[in-house]
Interface confidence: low
């Protein structure tokens, strides 16, 4: 499937503290318009044995809330201005990890979908549900490729370091593109 095709590639990111990429600033996943990004939540076997059975570095099953944030929110790992995209709160889900799928579509097909633009970066961070887990996991998504065909967009893309290309295709487990984000209240400042 070529860039911008109706059926895009799928990219997988495993969102847990064992994923060293997420623990440093700069990790970027590059996608094309209409690609999917599948974010897999931390997952542990109920039996406590086998792959994925062990808890993260802090001990206990990791649980996170994923937010879409501004560049400033990404840099400071601050979700106060972002909105909730997904909650990783079922670490012992049966059979397989919970997955959140984001489709990088130019036009939102869902009432609560999102409109993405080629040549731009988008930012995701998580906050741990329990303090003992990794404080700041974060990721940039770069939507390729620059285009001037929509709404007068003239992006000036600068591909960051640590850019990851498409992964192999993976099976669809469940898509939550229409899931309602819950918005955190702003406290004192809206200046970012």
């Amino acid at each position: 499937q070529g860039p911008g095709g109706a059926l895009g590639n799928r990219h997988a990111v495993y969102w847990n503290s064992s994923n060293q990429h997420l623990r440093r600033e700069g990790y970027t996943v590059q996608v094309n318009v209409n690609d999917y990004l599948d974010i897999y939540c931390p997952h542990y076997n109920s039996s406590g044995v086998g792959p994925g059975a062990g808890p993260g570095p802090g001990g206990g099953a990791e649980q996170y809330v994923l937010y879409m944030v501004s560049r400033n929110g990404y840099r400071t790992c601050n979700a106060s201005q972002g909105f909730k995209r997904w909650e990783c709160n079922r670490p012992h889900a049966p059979h397989s990890p919970i997955k959140f799928s984001e489709k990088f579509q130019r036009y939102s097909a869902f009432s609560l979908g999102y409109e993405f633009h080629a040549g731009h970066e988008y930012y995701y961070i998580s906050t741990p549900t329990h303090n003992l887990h990794w404080k700041c996991l974060r990721m940039k998504v770069f939507v390729c490729c620059a285009s001037t065909s929509h709404s007068g967009e003239k992006p000036v893309p600068t591909l960051p370091q640590f850019t990851m290309g498409p992964n192999v295709k993976i099976n669809v487990l469940e898509d939550f593109e229409g899931e309602n984000p819950q918005v955190p209240k702003l406290e004192k400042s809206i200046s970012g």
Epitope: R71, H120, P155, P157
Partner: antibody
């Protein structure tokens, strides 16, 4: 605190170009956000015209796409609006505002006081 | 483009009265934003993400809605609330504003 201030020509003749400058203090325009131009016509209708993002990318409203250019001078922390081939219909108060880039969570949170530009022979 | 239609265009309310104004979009949107503008001043962000009050906005204001239909409500009108209120969307390009509702004191 973040402050934006527009400076404009006041009066422009039809068919000429309109140029407005926005000077930003208290926040670097290369740090984050998009830096927008919004105008308000005499009947109070508001129209988003376009932006230049922190990275220098631009995005324009199709209604003015063929006539507009938004640029910046990062050394002066300024960004600029140029609107070509103006007519009397372009008479408006021109505002600069800080807002979201592409669509990530943000809003027009800081606005300049606006500058009135009249197009008249 | 996604046209936002505000109604009524002009309204008046007595002090202490409940006020509701509406904004309808011709295509469904994710969130509505509201701005307050007073004479000879620039618009101020008033409500974001449909229902969240911007810092400094009195608690008598509230926002609600989904899909195509949104509203701003003042539980008890006060003199300082006299202004024009604009709705605005970021969901689809180009970003658009409503025509405004001018709220006057009766």
């Amino acid at each position: 605190d973040v402050h934006l201030q527009e400076t404009g020509p006041g009066l422009v003749k039809p068919s000429q170009s309109l140029s407005v400058t926005c000077t930003v203090t208290g926040y670097s325009i290369t740090s984050d956000y998009a830096w927008n131009w919004i105008r308000q016509f005499p009947g109070n209708k508001l129209e988003w015209m376009g932006y230049i993002s922190y990275s220098g990318g631009t995005r324009y409203n199709p209604s003015v796409k063929s006539r507009i250019s938004i640029t910046r001078d990062t050394s002066k922390n300024q960004f600029f609006l140029q609107l070509n081939s103006v007519t009397t219909e372009d008479t408006a108060t021109y505002y600069c505002a800080r807002g979201p880039y592409a669509g990530y969570p943000a809003w027009f949170d800081y606005w300049g006081p606006g500058t009135l530009v009249t197009v008249s022979a | 483009e996604n046209v936002l239609t505000q109604s009524p265009a002009i309204m008046s309310a007595s002090l202490g009265e409940k006020v509701t104004m509406s904004c309808r979009a011709n295509s469904s949107i994710n969130y509505m934003y509201w701005y307050q503008q007073k004479s000879d001043a620039s618009p101020k962000l008033w409500i974001y993400y449909t229902s969240n009050l911007a810092p400094g906005v009195p608690a008598r204001f509230s926002g609600s809605g989904s899909g195509n239909s949104y509203s701003l409500t003042i539980s008890s009108m006060e003199g300082e609330d006299a202004a024009t209120y604009y709705c605005q969307q970021f969901t689809s390009s180009p970003w658009t504003f409503g025509g405004g509702t001018k709220l006057e004191i009766k």
